[in-house]
Amino acid sequence: QGQDRHMIRMRQLIDIVDQLKNYVNDLVPEFLPAPEDVETNCEWSAFSCFQKAQLKSANTGNNERIINVSIKKLKRKPPSTNAGRRQKHRLTCPSCDSYEKKPPKEFLERFKSLLQKMIHQHLSSRTHGSEDS
């Protein structure tokens, strides 16, 4: 049940990431650690790297408020789960600083890709033999 709540939150975050992608020109063009091709069992560690990244509004134009609200939603801590707790103790996952740094557009694309991977794994895990290739 806790894991379900977590994944439902991930699905909602995809929408927020997609909204932010519309305002990518209004974000500070800073390079941020952006995990890609995350190894199995390091998804939650990579997720926390995305959450910790200093994504910021460039404070220009009329979009500042909506951008800041969206960034705040992205950073909101999800409810704790056993899977998340187990992964926190994995010392083999790369540190956030070790991931390649990318500008906001690629950062958001990689964040979305990780969220999709986590949801897909969750959906597949409760279906016998669902993965076809």
Epitope: R11, I119, S124, S130
Partner: antibody
Framework: QVQLQESGPGLVKPSETLSLTCTVS????????WGWIRQPPGKGLEWIGY???????NYNPSLKRRVTISVDTSRNQFSLKLSSVTAADTAVYYC???????????WGQGTLVTVSS | DIQMTQSPSSVSASVGDRVTITCRAS??????LAWYQHKPGKAPKLLIY???SLQSGVPSRFSGSGSGTDFTLTISSLQPEDFATYYC?????????FGGGTKVEIK
Amino acid sequence: QVQLQESGPGLVKPSETLSLTCTVSGGSISSDFWGWIRQPPGKGLEWIGYISSRGSTNYNPSLKRRVTISVDTSRNQFSLKLSSVTAADTAVYYCARSAGVTDFDAWGQGTLVTVSS
Amino acid sequence: DIQMTQSPSSVSASVGDRVTITCRASQGISSWLAWYQHKPGKAPKLLIYVASSLQSGVPSRFSGSGSGTDFTLTISSLQPEDFATYYCQQANSFPLTFGGGTKVEIK
């Protein structure tokens, strides 16, 4: 705003292979999941399957033996092949995007495929 | 496979009416439910995902609720453009499955 458009023959003979292509415009196919759903005349919607931009697939077990979904990122297209068709495969076929993996947020308008000799 | 049962199969209503459509899953699906609107010859449109989250650009008169096996789509004040067929879809497990649809007709 992403748009999807199905294309392919509207008439297929029994025992042959149904082939449809979905062209994606206004967005890149190199992210998200891309699926096919069909609706037989007078019936409800049936999920056929989907493919991720990286090529991993999930199919409806009821069709799995006969279905192949593939993606061509260079053309921004993905396609459906359904082999050994019968009259029961007559339906409107929709292609759709699943950004959220669990639901379909953009659809094509659908194309009617009739299986008949 | 998880079976999705919608009721009613059709409903006649007038502009301004409150319309409620229900969807029942054959087993618990948490909040993994989406609602779509479909008009003849048009592309289906996602209205609600994860039971109650409104898809971007969808009017706030549409709302979704429920969890487990019983779900509801409510249109608070029916507009002329809302006459269509509505489908629910579960995403708790593969294969993804749809309800049989509810047609909202003009009274």
